[in-house]
Amino acid sequence: MMTGTIETTGNISAKKGGSVILQCHLSSTMAQVTQVNWEQHDHSLLAIRNAELGWHIYPAFKDRVAPGPGLGLTLQSLTMNDTGEYFCTYHTYPDGTYRGRIFLEVLESSGGGGAGGGGHHHHHHHHHH
């Protein structure tokens, strides 16, 4: 039975040209996390964090994605095109797969809005394949 929940940084905003931390946390389960996949709204994989093998940042994002902190991901040099949904997919044993969702809004530099995850809220979401 899947008992875990994923807490994410929820809906976040950051300024164009700035950076933002995408963060998920799996709780309420004793399952072993074998891998975390970070994915973009359009089927793109940003990065994979394998528990034993470490980080693989996808070639298209190597220049502006940094691993961490922890199992999270730092997105740098933000553009307006980065606005959209991001997903963390936790592969666990024996539970299976949990998924969390983050919505990032990139704001024009001149406009208001917080930098690096300002004005975000936390939500819980779990999903099993």
């Epitope: 994989l45 994979i48 093998l53 693989h56 298209a60």
Partner: antibody, heavy 121, light 107 residues
Amino acid sequence: DVQLQESGPDLVKPSQSLSLTCTVTGYSITSGYSWHWIRQFPGNKLDWMGYVHYSGSTNYNPSLKSRISITRDTSKNQFFLQLNSVTTEDTATFYCARMDYGNYGGAMDYWGQGTSVTVSS
Amino acid sequence: EIVMTQSHKFMSTSVGDRVSITCKASQDVRTAVAWYQQKPGQSPKLLIYSASYRYTGVPDRFTGSGSGTDFTFTISSVQAEDLAVYYCQQYYSTQWTFGGGTKLEIK
């Protein structure tokens, strides 16, 4: 340049253990990467078996977990496959390979030439 | 376990032709796919990783595309030395799996 070379018996009897060696030259298996065993059945199907990480930790295909062991001898720069309780279904060509996870994800960039093992009485 | 299906076991082509080999994943694997070439009597060689990126030294006639569940490997102008079996592999999950292979035959 990195080179991997498999060695071991051509023939193993059913219910016995299959033991293979992969000798790596041109790179120390304790310096980085993960070091894998893959088998190819007659008819070409490829099956990932497991690996030993440069740190010494191991990970196995769940379908083999009760029968497989991967170990290493760092002084000889070798890693080993042991598959227990073999049946004729384990007849295959066995490859050792390297995975550079940071650069290529789960793709294997260097392979040995393979060694063929028949399980038969 | 994610199953990778290469529906064509054999494909026949002529030197200079363009040929495409397909691979279908049983679930969404995003772009976590590699392609290998295995020539007769040899071990597999990595050609493509991350669905569309050529490995070092791979000629640019070899390309990969696709995301999600459907992937394609294309040779833009087949050469005689491309006679081989081509395999896809997924690494989206922690249990890596391969397609059954497509044997490219030169007419």
